[in-house]
């Protein structure tokens, strides 16, 4: 069983009094159908809460909303609905919060049917004041901020126009018509697809991909026969229709679309899809759907150019386009990802990789856990994690797995222990080493969150009954204390804490119901007095990530280097603090074949670290398409894994000879690219 409140646990002294002095209740004088909450800026303490109520009438929606603001992390709220002239705010657009600490907020209002355009309310002072602006168009999407300049906004209109503002929504200009999808790239570049004939749907596979680097003064067509496009890390991807049939292929560019290369990935048919699961500046994880309605596909990992792909994982669960996948980046430890596979018997199993997709394995069975009914062998089984797919299937799973970059090594997730994911009520498990080992943390489903960079974990039981108890742990989930935060239980709807896990405040949201009334209520608990002193050097200990065998000279080496971290000792009850920076020390490892992926035309036989030539290509000149030219590849079959920092040791070399022949690609080649000006 999970550790409880017994004599073995180091109890925090006088915590009830300390927490009672730091528990703040706020009752909202309405109960509207929904509540949405947004944090404005980082470490500002500003929260906006929008409560909305709407009744769809025959010709229009009648609605009401209220806007509340807190500037003390949710301890107190002020009704600021008058700042937006008591206007009904459209919840489907949410609250568009500006990047970083810009303090910018855009709220999109509901307007009456006959109006010329929409209406927005803009704030650039962390929602202290709002300016009403009437738009020359009806927005179809939420306003999108440029990541580089929060004054630059783009939006699509219901008429498929692409609109841009250069002064934070004060003035708007339509820069292009017939636009299907638009995205900000780097350096204030906008990428978008356009249709020529009927509509986005009708022209799917015949769209053009355009780019503007000057907010619509001039344009460049960078692709034709486009089905869709996506951005990931420094890569621009486009799926492009083939000339001969209805299949499409991925093309990739690392220079904003000036030159393209065909990705060495299988082509897909009409019913299939590609999906970028994760991407960074080094590489990309790409899911390629299997033909037919299988619900699975294959994960491929790219080289540093996004062109050569290695098969990473078969039978990867991904239900449909835009459907559910359990693919999760474990942000608390470099190189770790968790996902689910659909096995031959249609059961779902969890897999984990510690080396960025190089090898996948089952999760180790937690110590002191029994294998459940799904296990053939009661002594040998694995932990299986519930994520998006389980949530979509309405299993009793209130939350997806949780990890935070500044809470090193910590992963919290619902799971079951057996041969496959179980439909039984799950328990909550924790790993403190990035997924290598697991322990049952709490019995039954819970909501959970990480505070103070891992110094505190907070949990609330998932129950259909009203609740008034919160649990917290100061030792990474080993021991738990319970605190009754109110005498009158509430129907719990959610836990809210500031993104980034640096805060020591948690807000518990819910509503109360009595005979005649029901009201939204929030309780904000500040844990600062539980962690009453700042952590010192003696509170930290040194930890080697990815350690599996101390007797191995290269223990801890992942992607060519090992990292040692200063981690808070489990027995230390102290504040990491808002300014806490993870202290780590990398050291370079010697290269081995594990640090290389197989180059184009090569593959790794199972359980072998050597790359061998693909049989169908044996003896052929390896010619492939790169930057719109045909290349001849002289290789011994290896290419360094993206992001790998190893030095010395094994060093297989490769060489590329440029044949300077144009590729016969149906994709728009560089010399055909045209520039247009507005």
């Amino acid at each position: 069983s999970a550790p409880g409140e017994d004599e073995e646990c180091g109890r925090v002294r006088d915590f009830v009094a300390k927490l009672a002095n730091n528990t703040h209740q706020h009752v909202f004088d309405d109960l509207r159908a929904s509540v949405s909450l947004s944090w404005v800026g980082d470490s500002t303490g500003v929260i906006l809460v929008l409560t909305t109520f709407h009744v769809p009438l025959v010709i229009m929606t009648f609605g009401q909303s209220k806007l509340y603001r807190s500037e003390d992390y949710g301890k107190n709220f002020k009704d600021i609905t008058d700042l937006i002239n008591n206007t009904f705010i459209r919840t489907e657009f949410g609250m568009a919060i500006g990047p970083e600490n810009s303090g910018k907020v855009v709220l999109t209002a509901e307007v009456s049917g006959g109006s010329r355009g929409g209406r927005i309310f803009r704030s650039s002072d962390f929602a202290k004041n709002f300016v009403q602006t009437d738009l020359p168009f009806h927005p179809l999407t939420q306003m999108m901020y440029s990541p580089q300049n929060s004054d630059y906004l783009l939006a699509l209109s219901t008429e498929n126009g692409l609109w841009v503002s250069k002064n934070f929504g004060g003035k708007w200009e339509e820069i292009h018509k017939a636009v299907c999808l638009a995205k900000w790239g780097s350096d204030n570049t906008i990428f978008f697809t356009t249709y020529a004939n009927g509509s986005c749907k009708a022209d799917l596979g015949a769209l053009e991909l355009w780019r503007t680097s000057d907010l619509g003064k001039s344009f460049k067509t960078i692709g034709v026969k486009i089905y869709s496009f996506g951005l990931g890390g420094r890569f621009l991807f486009a799926s492009v229709m083939a000339d001969k049939d209805t299949t499409r292929r991925i093309h990739v560019s690392t220079d904003q679309g000036d030159t393209w290369s065909m990705a060495q990935l299988p082509s897909v048919g009409q019913e299939q899809f590609y999906s970028i699961l994760a991407a960074n500046d080094d590489m990309v994880f790409m899911h390629v759907d299997e033909p037919g309605d299988t619900g699975f596909g294959t994960i491929f990992t790219s080289d540093d150019r996004g062109i050569v792909y290695s098969k990473s994982l078969d039978r990867h669960l991904y239900t449909t386009t835009g459907g559910e996948t359990d693919f999760t980046n474990v942000t608390s430890l470099r190189g770790v990802y968790i996902t689910s596979v659909l096995s031959e018997d249609n059961s779902i199993q969890t897999m984990i990789t510690f080396d960025q997709g190089g090898r996948w394995t089952h999760l180790r069975k937690p110590e002191n856990s029994e294998c459940d009914a799904t296990a053939k062998n009661k002594n040998e089984c694995s932990l299986h994690i519930h994520a998006s797919y389980s949530i979509s299937q309405k299993l009793n799973v209130p939350m997806a797995p949780l990890s935070e970059p500044n809470a090193v090594g910590i992963v919290i997730a619902h799971g079951s222990v057996g041969d496959a994911i179980s439909v039984m009520v799950p328990d909550v498990y924790i790993s403190d080493d990035g997924g290598y080992s697991w322990t049952k943390m709490l019995e039954g489903p819970h909501y959970y969150t990480i505070l103070d960079s891992g110094g505190i974990i907070v949990a609330i039981e998932h129950s259909s009954r009203p609740i008034n108890v919160i649990k917290f742990s100061t030792d990474e989930g080993q021991c738990w204390q319970t605190y009754t935060f109110t005498r009158d239980p509430i129907y719990f709807t959610g836990l809210a804490s500031e993104p980034g896990a640096r805060s020591m405040n948690i807000s518990i949201w819910g509503f109360t119901e009595s005979f005649l009334t029901s009201q939204w209520v929030s309780y904000t608990i500040d844990f600062k007095d539980i962690l009453e002193r700042n952590c010192e050097e003696k509170d930290y200990t040194i930890w080697l990530a990815h350690s599996t065998d101390p007797e191995d000279y290269e223990d801890g080496c992942i992607l060519g280097y090992k990292e040692q971290f200063l981690r808070l000792r489990k027995s230390s009850v102290c504040q990491n603090g808002r300014d806490y920076v993870v202290t780590k020390q990398p050291s370079i490892c010697l290269c081995s074949l594990e640090d290389f992926l197989c180059d184009f035309g090569y593959y790794r036989p199972e359980n072998d670290s050597k790359c061998v030539e693909q049989p169908e290509l044996k003896g052929h000149d390896l010619e492939f398409c790169l930057y719109g030219r045909e290349e001849h590849l002289t290789t011994n079959g290896y290419r360094k894994i993206p992001g790998d920092k190893c030095q010395g040791g094994v060093n297989p070399v490769r060489e590329v000879k440029d044949l300077k022949k144009k590729c016969t690609s149906n994709f728009l080649s560089p010399e055909k690219q045209n520039s247009k000006s507005n």
Epitope: I542, P550, R569, S571
Partner: antibody
Framework: QVQLVQSGAEVKKPGSSVKVSCKAS????????ISWVRQAPGQGLEWMGG????????NYAQKFQGRVTITADESTSTAYMELSSLRSEDTAVYYC?????????????????WGQGTTVTVSS | DIQMTQSPSTLSASVGDRVTITCRAS??????LAWYQQKPGKAPKLLIY???SLESGVPSRFSGSGSGTEFTLTISSLQPDDFATYYC????????FGGGTKVEIK
């Protein structure tokens, strides 16, 4: 089998410094922390500090902070402990010991291999 | 720093006796406790790590238990070779040792 071999006995004057070495053989020196523990005549064990050879990450007991320096040379698989401003109370047997390790934590699993000890006598 | 209090400081026992030594930490150290045996003129020898895990090569008559702040080392049947001084050591703060328990012949 891992072995830790320490340098020989030392006699030192008060106020001077002593540097004791600890050479490892037969194991992966770099992957384990080395602790230094001392034992005054007829007394108990006292931890002075430790070092992780990879990166040379050292930490010290509060009592010895500023007076002890622990270093490691990966190329020779040797750890060193230097104690300065010696006084008569520093007369003791000084041990180096390898911290056993089962996970990524260096100091949590006890000291599984010990050196033979180095006697340091501080006398005027 | 975390203080470790060991008791008793001296223990007289006979061969075949069941011997129990207690160690108390000034604050919770979870299971991060080790036990050592030391004979005169020799370096200490690790017996138990992580409160209850037996170090390889150590006879099974030695066992450890406890968690949090209270720990015990038990020798189920004392052998002639077991007369020595025993130390507990916590590993979750800066390392500290208990004062030692001398097991002598009754």
């Amino acid at each position: 089998q891992v072995q830790l071999v320490q340098s020989g006995a030392e006699v030192k004057k008060p106020g001077s410094s002593v540097k004791v070495s600890c050479k490892a053989s037969g194991g992966t020196f770099r992957n384990y922390a080395i602790s230094w523990v001392r034992q005054a005549p007829g007394q108990g064990l006292e931890w002075m500090g430790g070092i992780i050879p990879i990166g040379g990450w050292a930490n010290y007991a509060q009592k010895f902070q500023g007076r002890v320096t622990i270093t490691a040379d990966e190329s020779t698989s040797t750890a060193y402990m230097e104690l300065s401003s010696l006084r008569s109370e520093d007369t003791a047997v000084y041990y180096c010991a390898r911290q056993g390790r089962k996970t990524g934590y260096y100091y949590y699993y006890g000291m599984d291999v010990w050196g033979q000890g180095t006697t340091v006598t501080v006398s005027s | 720093d975390i203080q470790m209090t060991q008791s008793p400081s001296t223990l007289s026992a006979s061969v075949g006796d069941r011997v129990t030594i207690t160690c108390r930490a000034s604050q919770s150290i979870s299971s991060w406790l080790a036990w050592y045996q030391q004979k005169p003129g020799k370096a200490p020898k690790l017996l138990i790590y992580k409160a209850s895990s037996l170090e390889s090569g150590v006879p099974s008559r030695f066992s450890g238990s406890g968690s949090g702040t209270e720990f015990t080392l038990t020798i189920s049947s004392l052998q002639p070779d077991d007369f020595a001084t025993y130390y507990c050591q916590q590993a979750d703060g800066h390392i500290t040792f208990g004062g030692g328990t001398k097991v002598e012949i009754k």
